[in-house]
Amino acid sequence: KEEQISFRDCAEVFKSGHTTNGVYTLTLPNSTEEVKAYCDMEAGGGGWTIIQRREDGSVDFQRTWKEYKVGFGNPSGEYWLGNEFVSQLTNQQRYVLKIHLKDWEGNEAYSLYEHFYLSSEELNYRIHLKGLTGTAGKISSISQPGNDFSTKDADNDKCICKCSQMLTGGWWFDACGPSNLNGMYYPQRQNTNKFNGIKWYYWKGSGYSLKGTTMMIRPADF
């Protein structure tokens, strides 16, 4: 009987010889649960598992805790891979996180964290980050130390308000903090002075809502 080959992440897909960008099926070790993820096999050596993408406003990111847990959207377009999968994956080995950003003026920038993982659901998928480099700001736009994840139906932030309801989208909100890549998508010429847009403060400043974002992870030893 032929043994089925499964891949935990896009790095394993890449190393198996599949070096074309696209949607692949991933499975965690000792699990039968599959997720569909987009693999970037070209950028920076390839092997990147895309965990978030915004590009055109086609997908609603104001979702529930459960939806952010299991993932939603279209892996070929806008989507969120799922906090549970990412948490389990990033606790099995060391991963780096790269966040790629596009503004409306044709500029691109990135933030690279040399160590990234999410806590378990019991700990509200708290984000842990170390070692920032890149062109999207010398200071982390994801508040440090990392915060718990909040959604419209799970208020885990440090604000007297409910950040997820005020800013829209699920995110590791502080009160509410210098970033929210899951905010409302605003088109060009309507993307400034926004209280609830797609924000990465230490690159574009306050109120600027970005054109595109991609969050991707890869094993540190790739």
Partner: nanobody, 129 residues
């Protein structure tokens, strides 16, 4: 569409006075805090004064306490900064900015710079003899 428009800047002699205005549209002052910030050439933008209408709170940087007064007129949806006893070191572009009043960390009274998501274009204040 949210807009903030500053006016009232200009050239004034040391010891003189100016009143800056910040006219807001696209939202009402009741639900927001308005801050005045300034940026001198080659320096970081710094907070000068803020007002939160829902509880009447005001804030002043130590460097302007006793000289500047912030106020608001809800009927005009406008916030003012009365600047007296002006000094050469007050020379800067002055900006007003808005933040939802509720976006406060537990136990804090005011907001970090990055929470102010709506900004005006600024008005230049020059203090010189």
């Amino acid at each position: 569409e949210v807009q903030l428009v500053e006016s009232g800047g200009g050239l004034v002699q040391p010891g003189g006075s100016l009143r800056l205005s910040c006219a807001a549209s696209g939202f009402t002052l009741d639900d927001y805090a308005i801050g005045w910030f300034r940026q001198a050439p080659g320096k970081e933008r710094e907070g000068v004064s803020s007002i939160r209408d829902n509880d009447g709170s005001t804030y002043y940087a130590d460097s302007v306490k006793g000289r500047f007064t912030i106020s608001s007129d809800n009927s005009k949806n406008t916030v003012y900064l009365q600047m007296n006893s002006l000094r050469p070191e007050d020379t800067a572009v002055y900006y007003c900015a808005a933040v939802p009043a509720g976006r406060l960390r537990f136990g804090e009274q005011w907001y970090p710079l990055y929470e102010y998501d709506a900004w005006g274009q600024g008005t230049l204040v020059t203090v010189s003899s």
